[in-house]
């Protein structure tokens, strides 16, 4: 079975980790693939290792574990996320987490960042 | 319409390395959503499950072959095949190669080569 | 290893019977057993996945039912190209194991 948190939130401008859980008592996994709607975003194979979609590279690391953590946040990154389990002899698992992009709690309380600098 | 084909020698002498061939026509093996099984059927007897291979070179097989069977994936010539080393007389079989699918939960051997009989003898 | 037990191991009937098949796993394998029917010199062909799902293009007179170790496949009117060997398969865990196969015959 798949195991993942459904719904979570995160800032505009922050990152996010997507994860999700896989138990079986008698599947092997092989693979695992990761996708923003139908886009891949990143695939996991035990034999060749990490693939990370060339336009997510800037933004997506892969791990922790067979999870990925999604950087650099932005409002269109709010979505459905999937991922996928090829797993012998059991099959195709499949998991799904809702991603909600919210505005940064600055931008939200209307505040201006300011970066200062040592002096002297 | 998926289609398998096994090519190999039909006559292996003891103590040699049987190698066998499945060529894949109306599909890619390179699918993610499939797996690939050698399977073999003694003359007059049932079916034992040799081994099965993603595309990515895991591989699955039966310990009573304990380390005798190798199964490599050639993705450029849509091909996996068989190697089993040290064979006797006990291996002289009906080779058959399969694709595990549909997409189900722990899916059965949905489309079939047609079987090659490989003998063992000197 | 899971041992797959078929009954009867061979059996004969007539055109127009209801034949009935049993499996038993040494364990619970869930609903992950299929059926296979091979005729002579012919490689086996899906008939049932997941105990009871009929594959795409077989005559719904095949049928099968049960879950966890017990398992049954079933004719219910019997024809003439059904005359063949069947098999039972688990696919829960790995060594993939088979029955020992029924062969319907002609009586």
């Known amino acids: 079975t798949i195991d993942t948190k459904r719904n979570i939130s995160a800032e505009e401008g922050g990152s996010v980790i997507l994860q999700c859980h896989f138990s079986s008592d008698t599947a092997e996994v092989t693979q695992v693939d990761w996708k923003q709607q139908d886009q891949l975003l990143a695939i996991y194979s035990v034999d060749l290792g990490w693939h990370v979609a060339s336009v997510f590279s800037d933004r997506v690391v892969p791990g922790p574990s067979l999870g990925l953590t999604f950087q650099s946040l932005t409002m269109n990154d709010t979505g459905e996320y999937f991922c996928t389990y090829h797993t012998y002899p059991g099959g195709i698992y499949k998991g799904r987490i809702f991603l909600k992009v919210q505005e940064s709690s600055d931008d939200r309380n209307g505040l201006a960042q300011f970066q200062t600098a040592p002096l002297g | 319409q998926l289609q398998l084909q096994e090519s190999g020698p039909g006559l292996v002498k003891p103590a040699e390395t049987l190698s066998l061939t499945c060529t894949v026509s109306?599909?890619?093996?390179?699918?993610?959503?499939?797996?690939w099984t050698w399977i073999r059927q003694p003359p007059g007897k049932g079916l034992e499950w040799i081994g099965t291979?993603?595309?990515?070179?895991?591989?699955f097989h039966n310990p009573s072959l304990k380390s005798r069977v190798t199964i490599p994936v050639d993705t450029s010539k849509n091909q996996f095949s068989l190697k089993l080393s040290s064979v006797t007389a006990a291996d002289t079989a009906v080779y058959y190669c399969?694709?595990?699918?549909?997409?189900?939960?722990?899916?059965?051997?949905?489309?079939w080569g047609q079987g090659t009989l490989v003998t063992v003898s000197s | 290893d899971i041992q797959m037990t078929q009954s009867p191991s061979s059996l004969s009937a007539s055109v127009g019977d209801r034949v009935t098949i049993t499996c038993r796993a040494s364990?619970?394998?869930?609903?992950?057993l299929n059926w296979y029917q091979q005729k002579p010199g012919k490689a086996p062909k899906l008939l049932i996945y997941?105990?009871?799902s009929l594959q795409s293009g077989v005559p719904s007179r095949f049928s099968g039912s049960g879950s966890g170790t017990d398992f049954t496949l079933t004719i219910s009117s019997l024809q003439p190209e059904d005359f063949a060997t069947y098999y039972c398969?688990?696919?829960?865990?790995?060594?993939?194991?088979f029955g020992g196969g029924t062969k319907v015959e002609i009586k």
């Open positions: 399969a694709r595990v699918g549909p997409d189900v939960s722990h899916p059965p051997f949905d489309y």
């Open positions: 109306g599909g890619s093996i390179s699918s993610y959503d499939h797996y």
């Open positions: 291979v993603y595309y990515s070179g895991s591989t």
């Open positions: 364990q619970s394998i869930s609903s992950y």
């Open positions: 997941a105990a009871s």
């Open positions: 398969q688990q696919s829960y865990s790995t060594p993939i194991t």
